[in-house]
């Protein structure tokens, strides 16, 4: 299982919110699936809290790529038979530690509620639930404790009296080869898959089954909770889109269907048709990461958290990638330093957001007859012949780059340079070879280079694309 911000919901954060070290606990609560009880009702099927909880420490601005979560399983013992259909409530609680923790020692970070159908003895069922900005990944299964076996844990097994066989009329207990089915206390013939009993000689049916021995699928008219009959009346199936599909109840509220509509049972601190109204007040300290609580003096007025730069969300719980808003103008590079944003500006621009277009030529004309040229978001000096540098103040040696090809000699001149070409060459830079037969002059291949090997070229090209 894992617990952390969902995809696209910001950098995974330590859950401590800069309030010192803390621990996470998970509280699992099971309620009867058919009940219309309010969310705050008792966990009638059982409840348990996770153990072996690691301590997290918060380093401001640091992220935690994955939260090391409480080890091991959360075991919820349930009494009597397993009902098969149930409501699963998982709450994630944070406990603040240390002498300077301040505020309430316990905070409910997230709460997921879902209705589930599960037979005992089956494999692990995997689930992902998102609530607000948090995502909870978990697996669950129902197991019978010996001597109980079966989908409802209603059949009992006893250790074999003899190593080779079970007593007269008793079958081996299939999951436990060393055990035998106990003498039936249920009504004879009661379906072992769909029936169970809590008293001798009774046969109580799991949801979707009926009849004295729980062998008859529930008929169309008696499918419960908006379920519809399956093919060839094999039982009741979950319906198509219903009022509770997608859980319209916000903030961890649980949804129940009522005559074609829905009803939300809201957790403490929330109310409204969809549990969308928060009854939390500023006195509850709902703003994390230095957020300031505004309004919300009483439960009837909603609070708002004003978040410090770099945080967002209704409780300032979500870190923002402020560079994603592209605040740097004119192609500036954005740097989110945590405490502040910085823009590294391209040449020719300045200001905190690179918003100022610098005019490099203003008040600083190019020297020695140079002219100011704009282009590519910056300005530069185009220097007259014989000058160079940023302001054209440096005398340039036009022959420094050895511009005359094929052994031509370079001479500096007030207007630039002149090449005196070696015999057999001509042109401004001695770039043309003169053919002795009087044919046209052709460009000479530069010395030191040869024709590219086509195979090598193709090989390199192929490699480049991998």
């Amino acid at each position: 299982h894992s617990f952390g911000p969902g995809p696209g919901l910001g950098t995974p954060r330590s859950p401590c919110n800069a309030r010192g070290p803390c621990r996470l606990f998970f509280r699992v609560c099971l309620k009867p699936g058919v009940s219309q009880e309010a969310t705050e009702s008792l966990c009638a099927l059982g409840a348990a809290l996770s153990t072996s909880v690691p301590v997290y420490t918060e380093h401001p601005g640091e992220s935690a790529a994955a939260l090391p979560l409480p080890d091991g399983l959360v075991r919820v013992p349930f009494r009597d038979a397993w009902p098969g259909t149930f409501s699963l409530v998982i709450e994630t609680w944070r406990e603040q530690l240390g002498e300077h923790a301040g505020g309430p020692a316990w905070n409910l970070l997230a709460r997921v509620v879902g209705r589930r159908r599960l037979a005992a003895g089956g494999p692990w069922a995997r689930d992902v639930q998102r609530t607000g900005t948090w995502e909870l990944h978990f697996s669950y299964r129902a197991r019978c404790e010996p001597p109980a076996v079966g989908a409802a844990c209603a059949r009992l097994c006893r250790s074999r009296s003899a190593p080779s066989r079970c007593g007269p009329g008793l079958r081996p207990c299939t999951p436990f080869p060393d055990e035998c089915e106990a003498p039936s206390v249920c009504r004879p013939g009661c379906s072992p898959e769909h029936g169970y009993c809590e008293e001798p000689d009774e046969c109580r049916c799991l949801e979707g089954w009926t009849g004295p021995l729980c062998t008859v699928p529930v008929s169309t008219s008696s499918c419960l909770n908006s379920r519809v009959p399956g093919p060839a009346s094999t039982g009741c199936l979950l319906p198509g889109p219903g009022p509770c599909d997608g859980n319209p109840c916000a903030n961890g509220g649980s949804c129940s269907e009522t005559s074609g509509s829905f009803e939300c049972a809201c957790p403490r601190g929330f109310y409204g048709l969809r549990c969308e109204v928060s009854g939390v007040t500023c006195a509850d300290g709902p703003c994390f990461n230095g957020g300031l609580c505004v309004g919300g003096e009483d439960p009837d007025s909603a609070y708002v958290c004003h978040c410090p730069p770099g945080f967002q969300g209704s409780n300032c719980e979500k870190r923002v990638d402020r560079c994603s808003l592209q605040p740097c103008q004119n192609g500036g590079l954005c740097l989110d330093l945590g405490h502040a944003l910085r823009c590294r500006c391209r040449a020719g621009f300045a200001g905190p957001r690179c918003e100022h277009d610098l005019d490099d030529c203003a008040g600083r004309a190019c020297a020695n007859g140079g002219t100011c040229v704009e282009g590519g978001g910056s300005r530069r000096c185009s220097c007259a012949l014989g000058f160079g540098g940023r302001d054209c103040r440096e005398r340039a040696d036009p022959c420094a780059s050895r511009p005359c090809a094929h052994g031509g000699r370079c001479y500096a001149h007030f207007s630039g340079l002149v090449c005196a070409c070696a015999p057999g060459y001509m042109g401004v830079r001695c770039e043309f070879a003169v053919r002795p037969d009087g044919a046209d002059a052709v460009p000479a291949a530069p010395r030191g280079l040869r024709q590219a090997d086509p195979q090598r070229f193709l090989h390199h090209h192929h490699h480049h694309h991998h």
Epitope: A18, H100, V294, A340
Partner: antibody, heavy 118, light 108 residues
Framework: QVQLQESGPGLVKPSETLSLTCTVS????????WTWIRQPPGKGLEWIGY???????NSNPSLKSRVTVSLDTSKSQFSLNLSSVTAADTAVYYC????????????WGQGTMVTVSS | EIVLTQSPGTLSLSPGERATLSCRAS???????LAWYQQKPGQAPRLLIY???SRATGIPDRFSGSGSGTDFTLTISRLEPEDFAAYYC?????????FGGGTKVEIK
């Protein structure tokens, strides 16, 4: 080095509007919330209001109906307007930067004394 | 609003002594969002402590903050001559932001 400088008239007549401007240098005004605080002579500090470049503002309910805080990112300035002033508004007015780990105030201007008198 | 009460109003001590300043809130400050400031005559306040116990940048370690809930303390372990000033606490948990009335630390 971030610096804040308050400016505005030192004397305002009763019932008029007190207007002050704070110029921010050394950092982008978009990086932080910015606030106004005042201190009457010989007394304690009173928070007036704050603003963020996104438009978020908040002010003290005891002054709310009279306070307007605004911000001009292009000039790197934020301003305070306090209407219908009385002698009780005589104070040193400070502009300050709101700390990025919570709404404390980590950098302050040197303050400007405003007297309300006819 | 959260009212902050500072005590004592004035604290007379000698250099080298330990100063303990108290700040009490009228209601719980849920997230330890409390700051301490120092103010010298004719100057703007200076942030010393935020989050009840974290020192601001450049603040000497003789200044320390503690407390949670409604009771907070600023301690100056050994008073230096430059520490004689007024000290204010401020909560930033809930709007409106409020300051305490101040404690003046004077030379005995």
């Amino acid at each position: 080095q971030v610096q804040l400088q308050e400016s505005g008239p030192g004397l305002v007549k009763p019932s008029e509007t007190l207007s002050l401007t704070c110029t921010v240098s050394g950092d982008s005004i978009s990086n932080y919330y910015w606030t106004w605080i005042r201190q009457p002579p010989g007394k304690g500090l009173e928070w007036i209001g704050y603003i963020y470049y996104s438009g978020t503002t908040n002010s003290n309910p005891s002054l709310k109906s009279r306070v307007t805080v605004s911000l001009d990112t292009s000039k790197s300035q934020f301003s305070l307007n306090l209407s219908s002033v009385t002698a009780a508004d005589t104070a040193v007015y400070y502009c300050a930067r709101v700390f990025n780990r919570g709404f404390a105030f980590d950098i302050w201007g040197q303050g400007t004394m405003v007297t309300v008198s006819s | 609003e959260i009212v902050l009460t500072q005590s004592p109003g004035t604290l007379s001590l000698s250099p080298g002594e330990r100063a303990t300043l108290s700040c009490r809130a009228s209601q719980r400050i849920s997230n330890t969002y409390l700051a301490w400031y120092q103010q010298k005559p004719g100057q703007a306040p200076r942030l010393l402590i935020y989050g009840a116990s974290s020192r601001a940048t450049g603040i000497p370690d003789r200044f320390s903050g503690s407390g949670s809930g409604t009771d907070f303390t600023l301690t100056i372990s050994r008073l230096e001559p430059e520490d004689f000033a007024a000290y204010y606490c401020q909560q930033y948990d809930t709007s409106p932001l409020t300051f305490g009335g101040g404690t003046k630390v004077e030379i005995k």
